[in-house]
């Protein structure tokens, strides 16, 4: 399990790097952040470290009330501060890892952090 979570953490951070450059990656991360009410890998400050992202900005999907541009010049009270790796990891352990053995490919595919099926399952629960 620790290995799986380590892989997920590494992959999530890698996809954060791709966020400004790849619309598909961005849409997946946006959906995860919005659905799981989280921001960044460990926490929202991870977005500061993305070279092509302005340091006073997080993706709009980090906002508690998502509107276009809400992540620009953000105030901490207006965003989800908890990181996604821990939050999604907890959900994965509870809802997925106990139900099926997830291969590293399930978590670490090129643009695939969690399967669409798993996200869909979370979204409706």
């Amino acid at each position: 399990r620790d290995k799986v979570m380590s892989e997920f953490n590494n992959n999530f951070r890698q996809q954060m790097e791709n966020y400004p450059k790849n619309n598909h990656t961005a849409s997946i991360l946006d959906r995860m952040q919005a659905d799981f009410k989280c921001c960044g890998a460990a926490n929202y400050t991870d977005w500061e470290k993305i070279p092509s992202m302005s340091k006073n900005r997080v993706p709009d999907s980090c906002c508690i009330n998502v509107t276009v541009g809400c992540g620009i010049n953000f105030n901490e009270k207006a965003i989800h501060k908890e990181g996604c790796v821990e939050k999604i990891g907890g959900w994965l352990r509870k809802n997925v890892l106990e139900q099926k053995l997830i291969s590293e490919e399930d978590l670490g595919g090129e643009q695939k952090l969690i399967s669409e099926e798993d996200l869909h399952h979370h979204h409706h629960h």
Partner: antibody, heavy 119, light 108 residues
Framework: QVQLVESGGGLVKPGGSLRLSCAAS????????MNWIRQAPGKGLEWVSY????????YYADSVKGRFTISRDNAKASLYLQMSSLKAEDTAVYYC????????????WGQGTTVTVSS | DIQMTQSPSSLSASVGDRVTITCRAS??????LNWYQQKPGKAPKLLIY???SLQSGVPSRFSGSGSGTDFTLTISSLQPEDFATYYC??????????FGQGTRLEIK
């Protein structure tokens, strides 16, 4: 009422240190980013540093990086600026400024405290 | 860093005049532009935020417009208390928070 009151300014020799304080009242301190902004005599406004609500994020102007340290004590609703290795060009009025962020603008300013660096 | 350039640097006008001050950003800042007024010996005061929104308590003779790189502050009918220095400031991409160099509005 909403108020920011700076203190700690004074005359200091080049290379010396000074600690500015700002006491906030009349609002929920943790709802805001806070800034230090300065104004040299007869000059315009220059941003010095900001710190986030929780203190997790802090940034400095290049002109003070490595010499100044911003901090906040949310329990005391206070903002601080520790200044060291002071130079003549740091002479200015220093303002403590409340920042709601997003698109709202810096809406509350203290009265300012004067720092003079001179031998 | 985003540079903010104000024009003119100084301006002479009379009570009742309509006055316009412009501010240009070195790159697009959307509408993340604020205007401040500062009187001698006093702290700056927020007048306009988000390019065109009037801060609470500010007289309606002040207005702001623009987006992207070009912005204006307009005082529709100058009052004696409006003679001061005005600054624009961007908050779109920080750090650093950057201000214009200021426009000094003097009595003609």
């Amino acid at each position: 009422q909403v108020q920011l009151v700076e203190s700690g300014g004074g005359l200091v020799k080049p290379g010396g240190s000074l600690r500015l304080s700002c006491a906030a009242s009349g609002f929920i301190f943790t709802d805001y980013f806070m800034n230090w902004i300065r104004q040299a005599p007869g000059k315009g406004l220059e941003w010095v540093s900001y710190i986030s609500n929780s203190g997790n994020i802090l940034y400095y102007a290049d002109s003070v990086k490595g010499r100044f340290t911003i901090s906040r004590d949310n329990a005391k609703a206070s903002l601080y600026l520790q200044m060291s290795s002071l130079k003549a060009e740091d002479t200015a009025v220093y303002y403590c400024v409340r920042d709601p962020r997003m698109f709202y603008g810096m809406d509350v300013w203290g009265q300012g405290t004067t720092v003079t660096v001179s031998s | 860093d985003i540079q903010m350039t104000q024009s003119p640097s100084s301006l002479s006008a009379s009570v009742g005049d309509r006055v316009t001050i412009t501010c240009r950003a070195s790159q697009s800042i959307s509408s993340y532009l604020n205007w401040y007024q500062q009187k001698p010996g006093k702290a700056p005061k927020l007048l306009i935020y988000a390019a065109s929104s009037l801060q609470s308590g500010v007289p309606s003779r002040f207005s702001g417009s623009g987006s992207g790189t070009d912005f204006t502050l307009t005082i529709s009918s100058l009052q004696p208390e409006d003679f001061a220095t005005y600054y624009c400031q961007q908050s779109y991409s920080t750090p650093p928070i950057t201000f214009g160099q200021g426009t000094r509005l003097e009595i003609k």
